[in-house]
Interface confidence: low
């Protein structure tokens, strides 16, 4: 499973996002996409 | 404009201590996501620690290589990241590079340093 | 760690032709990969997030494509300033980690 920290939000968000990761439903900046460095 | 500018790099003996700083500017430091990543001459890039924004509670990852010795911290009312380390090994010379990252969702940002040099030798 | 294995180690091509970059990793990273272009004495700037997205300011000639644990980095048409290092990286797991670098050099 993915253990990140981009992960944990990322299940607790809950739904995909064009980033490859997931992100809230609203329009509040979140980081949770999928982590680049 | 966006700036980072890291510091703090320098010639140390084995067992010695450093601290390397990066100054932030032209961006919402406090919402950006900060891993240190170090490349040794000639080879290829290591990620080496990252601390999250202060709203995921700054909370910090550490690779084993460099756990228990090197302490990744943020101050951002300075705008500024650090890296502590400690017990420095030859090992640890390595161009080191501050990148903060920030997603938007739909988009992301991604910074990076110049990087500074740090050589471990006697 | 999730190891991530590029080649080949080295390309040798010319202003024009197509590149074509494999990154494979040792255990499923779903799609979070991304490439990096390194030039001498510059640091790392990112090319491609989530596998397959297209960084700021990025050209359209660069794209990525993969899931799982095969993803590649294709340069449609090489241009003379794209001739760098290439790394691909994960974040799937900790420690995040990079691939040993692919040589993209002119022919």
């Known amino acids: 499973a993915c253990d990140t920290a981009t992960c944990v939000t990322h299940r607790l968000a809950g739904l995909l996002s064009r980033s490859g990761g997931v992100v809230k439903n609203n329009f509040v900046p979140t980081n949770v996409g999928s982590k680049a460095f | 404009e966006v700036q980072l500018v890291e510091s703090g790099g320098g010639l140390v003996q084995p067992g010695g201590s450093l601290r390397l700083s990066c100054a932030a500017s032209?961006?919402?430091?406090?919402?950006?996501?900060i891993s240190w990543v170090r490349q040794a001459p000639g080879k290829g890039l290591e990620w080496v620690a990252e601390?999250?924004?202060?709203?995921?509670?700054?909370?910090?990852h550490y690779a084993e290589a460099v756990k228990g010795r090197f302490t990744i911290s943020r101050d951002n009312a300075k705008n500024s990241l650090y890296l502590q380390m400690n017990s420095l090994r030859a090992e640890d010379t390595a161009v080191y590079y501050c990148?903060?990252?920030?997603?938007?969702?739909?988009?992301?940002?991604?910074?990076w340093g110049q990087g500074t040099l740090v050589t471990v030798s006697s | 760690e999730i190891v991530l294995t590029q080649s080949p180690a080295t390309l040798s091509l010319s202003p024009g032709e197509r590149a074509t970059l494999s990154c494979k990793a040792s255990k499923r990273v779903t799609t979070y990969v991304s490439w990096y272009q390194q030039k001498p004495g510059q640091a790392p700037r990112l090319l491609i997030y989530g596998a397959s997205n297209r960084y700021l300011g990025i050209p359209a000639r660069f794209s990525g494509s993969g899931s799982g644990t095969d993803f590649t980095l294709t340069i449609s048409s090489l241009e003379p300033e794209d001739f760098a290092v290439y790394y691909c990286?994960?974040?799937?797991?900790?420690?995040?980690?990079f691939g040993q670098g692919t040589k993209l050099e002119i022919k």
């Open positions: 032209g961006f919402t430091f406090s919402n950006y996501w």
């Open positions: 601390i999250r924004s202060e709203s995921d509670a700054s909370a910090t």
């Open positions: 990148n903060c990252y920030f997603d938007y969702g739909l988009a992301i940002q991604n910074y």
């Open positions: 990286s994960q974040s799937y797991n900790y420690p995040y980690t």
